[in-house]
C-alpha cells in the first residue's frame, strides 16, 4: 500500500436546501484505470461511511441507488455532492481515494471538509 496526497476544501456551508458540493483532488502517481472514492463522516470521534463509488477513468461515478451522494470525475478530480443534509449532519467529511488498478495499490485520505448545515426556517402558515 502506497500513500497518496488528497486535497479538499477545509470548510463548506451547505445550501439552504441541504446540498453540499466539494472537490476531492488526488495526486495520482501513475495511470490508474480504476478508482474508488469513499466519503467518511467524522463526528464526536466516531467515523462512519457516508457513501462510496468505484469508477473507471473517463466514466461517471456510480453510487448505490439509495445513496445521498452523487459525483462526477475529471482527471484527478472528483466533484462530490451530498444531498438531504440537515443541521444534525454537520461534521467533518473526509475523502478517501484508492487507486485499485493497475497495481500498485495507492491510498490517500484528505484532511476533511467541515460541512456546516443549517435547517431552513419553517415556512409560515398561509391561507392558500
Amino acid at each position: 500500500c502506497k500513500a497518496m496526497h488528497v486535497a479538499q476544501p477545509a470548510v463548506v456551508l451547505a445550501s439552504s436546501r441541504g446540498i453540499a458540493s466539494f472537490v476531492c483532488e488526488y495526486a495520482s502517481p501513475g495511470k490508474a484505470t480504476e478508482v474508488r472514492v469513499t466519503v467518511l463522516r467524522q463526528a464526536d470521534s466516531q467515523v462512519t461511511e457516508v457513501c462510496a463509488a468505484t469508477y473507471m477513468m473517463g466514466n461517471e461515478l456510480t453510487f448505490l441507488d439509495d445513496s445521498i451522494c452523487t459525483g462526477t470525475s475529471s482527471g484527478n478530480q472528483v466533484n462530490l455532492t451530498i444531498q438531504g443534509l440537515r443541521a444534525m449532519d454537520t461534521g467533518l467529511y473526509i475523502c478517501k481515494v484508492e487507486l485499485m488498478y493497475p497495481p500498485p495499490y495507492y491510498l490517500g485520505i484528505g484532511n476533511g471538509t467541515q460541512i456546516y448545515v443549517i435547517d431552513p426556517e419553517p415556512c409560515p402558515d398561509s391561507d392558500f
Epitope: 476544501p9 477545509a10 470548510v11 463548506v12 456551508l13 451547505a14 445550501s15 439552504s16 458540493s21 466539494f22 463526528a43 464526536d44 443541521a87 454537520t90 467533518l92 484532511n111 476533511g112 467541515q114 456546516y116 448545515v117 443549517i118
Partner: antibody, heavy 117, light 108 residues
C-alpha cells in the same frame, strides 16, 4: 504569511450603508470561510455571520437578517461585508476572521465604523 | 442557538499566580469545536486554544485547555505581565457560531 487585511475606518450617518473589505493572502482563499465579528465599544464579541468562500453560501445572525450582506470576490481573494440602514448602535470595530476547522484561526486588524449624525 | 457563559466576569490576580477560567455551554458541544481567544486593548482577538485543548501555533505552554460537553476550562499556569487581557470562549459546533461574554484577567 497568512493574513487578512481590512479596509480603513469609516464615519457614516444614520440610515446610510457601509461596506468593509477584507483581503486574504498566504492561503487558498476558497478552502475556508470568512466570518464577520463586531465589537461595540467596551463590549464583547458578536458574530454577525459568515460566508463560505468555496461556494458563496451565507449564514447571517438573525438580528441582522435583511440588513447585512456578505460576499466574496475569489479573483482577488477578498471578502466584503455590507451593513445597511445604519443606527448609532452599529458603532463598533468590525473584524473579519478566517473560519477554519474548529476555530476562527486568523483575524483581520479590525475596521472602526462610527455612526453619528 | 447555543448560549455560552463565562465565569468569573473579572479575575484579579498577581503575576506568577495560576488563573482558571470557566466556560459553560447551554447544550453539549463536541470538544473539537470549542476554542479560546485572547484580546488585548486595541487589538484583534488571537486564537489561543482550539479543539478544547490544542494550543494554536506560537502559544506558550503555560496556556492549557480542558473540558467536554458543556463545561470547559482555560488555565494559565503562571501569569505573565503580557497575559492580562480579556479571554473569550467560542463554539463553532452549531450555527450560529457564538462567543461567551468574556473574562477579564486584571492585575491585583
Amino acid at each position: 504569511q497568512v493574513q487578512l487585511v481590512q479596509s480603513g475606518a469609516e464615519v457614516k450617518k444614520p440610515g446610510a450603508s457601509v461596506k468593509v473589505s477584507c483581503k486574504a493572502s498566504g492561503y487558498t482563499f476558497t478552502s475556508y470561510g470568512i466570518s464577520w465579528v463586531r465589537q461595540a465599544p467596551g463590549q464583547g464579541l458578536e458574530c454577525m455571520g459568515w460566508i463560505s468562500a468555496y461556494n458563496g453560501n451565507t449564514n447571517y445572525a438573525q438580528k441582522l437578517q435583511g440588513r447585512v450582506t456578505m460576499t466574496t470576490d475569489t479573483s482577488t481573494s477578498t471578502a466584503y461585508m455590507e451593513l445597511r440602514s445604519l443606527r448609532s448602535d452599529d458603532t463598533a470595530v468590525y473584524y473579519c476572521a478566517r473560519v477554519g476547522i474548529g476555530a476562527f484561526d486568523i483575524w483581520g486588524q479590525g475596521t472602526m465604523v462610527t455612526v453619528s449624525s | 442557538e447555543i448560549v455560552m457563559t463565562q465565569s468569573p466576569a473579572t479575575l484579579s490576580l498577581s503575576p506568577g499566580e495560576r488563573a482558571t477560567l470557566s466556560c459553560r455551554a447551554s447544550q453539549s458541544v463536541s470538544s473539537s469545536y470549542l476554542s479560546w481567544y485572547q484580546q488585548k486593548p486595541g487589538q484583534a482577538p488571537r486564537l489561543l486554544i482550539y479543539g478544547a485543548s490544542t494550543r494554536a501555533t506560537g502559544i506558550p505552554a503555560r496556556f492549557s485547555g480542558s473540558g467536554s460537553e458543556t463545561d470547559f476550562t482555560l488555565t494559565i499556569s503562571s501569569l505573565q505581565p503580557e497575559d492580562f487581557a480579556v479571554y473569550y470562549c467560542q463554539q463553532v459546533y452549531n450555527l450560529p457560531f457564538t462567543f461567551g461574554p468574556g473574562t477579564k484577567v486584571d492585575i491585583k
